[in-house]
Interface confidence: low
């Protein structure tokens, strides 16, 4: 079987203040188990903004329903945008381990830019 | 003018505690982090720490874990670090560096450094 | 944790001659967006540190070009291409990859 791949379509996204961004996120197969998380920034101080498995992210919502049966889409919608949170955001893999998950493969990212809110 | 200014130097007894703060100007402060970094005399660098000033997430040296505690007041683009149960080893200078964007996350502004001396 | 090594630990240099300066990690510092998590910073006697270059081989806004940084994977250069008697201090790499994130032990560059 073909090794999962984690395709983000868009390599950038332009939004006005204010307004939502949707971030695209597919995964290619279900194998290796394990959740999805989205990050803005790529190394070590890249930030959580997502999490499927745990947490409470009260501007983020989801595109489809991730846990429904062979759901293949990750993508996610982050409303009132800023300035700040302009950056390249990267959509994850995890394969699950124990004690804790093991990061398996990213996306190449999408770089958000925030356009001034139109007066 | 962007810059970063810290607090003085501070004299502590071992046990005691000590607040530095890094008030940042010039830029906005919610579109980056602050790192904390310390450099004992005549040694090299340390990183202790940092904070994103965007969602206030901190990410702390394992070594430092349960002492150290990084915070920030956007209303004043302030960033504190609080060291406690202060030992003679932590006499260091102690510096805040901006992270220059957090897909990046090379330290490109430093303030000036606070010493703080540890002494009984 | 990763181990960043630098060398030389101390670097004689007559100004106006080339100079070079190594910096190996124990882990690959490639991340898959393509970019080095590998920054170089220059502390000059009495000063904080300044950011030199970002991401292996990025020279940081008002860096002069005779700094350069290049190197992949586990393997870094910093060189100067003609030292001036203002370059000297200690030249430290540090890598951002993985947290923590960790700093080379210096390389003291002096005028001879």
């Known amino acids: 079987e073909d090794e999962l791949q984690v395709i983000q379509p868009e390599k950038s996204v332009s939004v006005a203040a204010g307004e939502s961004a949707t971030l695209r996120c597919a995964m290619t197969s279900l194998i290796p188990v394990g959740p999805i998380m989205w990050f803005r920034g790529a190394g070590a101080g890249r930030e959580l903004i997502y999490n499927q498995k745990e947490g409470h992210f009260p501007r983020v919502t989801t595109v489809s329903e991730l846990t429904k049966r062979n759901n293949l889409d990750f993508s996610i919608s982050i409303s009132n945008i800023t300035p700040a949170d302009a950056g390249t955001y990267y959509c994850v893999k995890f394969r699950k381990g124990s004690p804790d998950d093991v990061e398996f493969k990213s996306g190449a990212g999408t770089e958000l830019s925030v356009r001034a809110k139109p007066s | 003018q962007v810059q970063l200014v810290q607090s003085g130097a501070e004299v502590k007894k071992p046990g005691a505690s000590v607040k530095v703060s890094c008030k940042a100007s010039?830029?906005?402060?919610?579109?980056?982090?602050i790192s904390w970094v310390r450099q004992a005399p005549g040694q090299g660098l340390e990183w202790m720490g940092w904070?994103?000033?965007?969602?206030?997430?901190?990410n702390y040296a394992q070594k430092l874990q349960g002492r150290v505690t990084m915070t920030t007041d956007t209303s004043t683009s302030t960033a504190y670090m609080e060291l406690r149960s202060l030992r003679s080893d932590d006499t260091a200078v102690y510096y805040c560096?901006?992270?220059?964007?957090?897909?990046?996350?090379?330290?490109?502004?430093w303030g000036r450094g606070t010493l703080v001396t540890v002494s009984s | 944790d990763i181990v960043m090594t630098q060398s030389p630990l101390s670097l004689p240099v007559t100004p106006g001659e080339p100079a070079s300066i190594s910096c190996r990690s124990s882990q690959s510092l490639l991340h898959s967006n393509g970019y080095n998590y590998l920054d170089w910073y220059l502390q000059k006697p009495g000063q904080s540190p300044q950011l030199l270059i970002y991401?292996?081989?990025n020279r940081a806004s008002g860096v002069p070009d005779r700094f350069s940084g290049s190197g992949s994977g586990t393997d870094f250069t910093l060189k100067i291409s003609r030292v001036e008697a203002e370059d000297v201090g200690v030249y430290y790499c540090?890598?951002?990859?993985?947290?923590?994130?960790?700093f080379g032990g210096g390389t003291k560059v002096e005028i001879k």
């Open positions: 991401l292996g081989s």
């Open positions: 560096a901006r992270v220059g964007n957090m897909d990046q996350e090379y330290f490109d502004l």
């Open positions: 540090m890598q951002t990859l993985r947290i923590p994130p960790t």
């Open positions: 904070i994103s000033a965007y969602n206030g997430n901190t």
């Open positions: 010039g830029y906005t402060f919610t579109s980056n982090g």
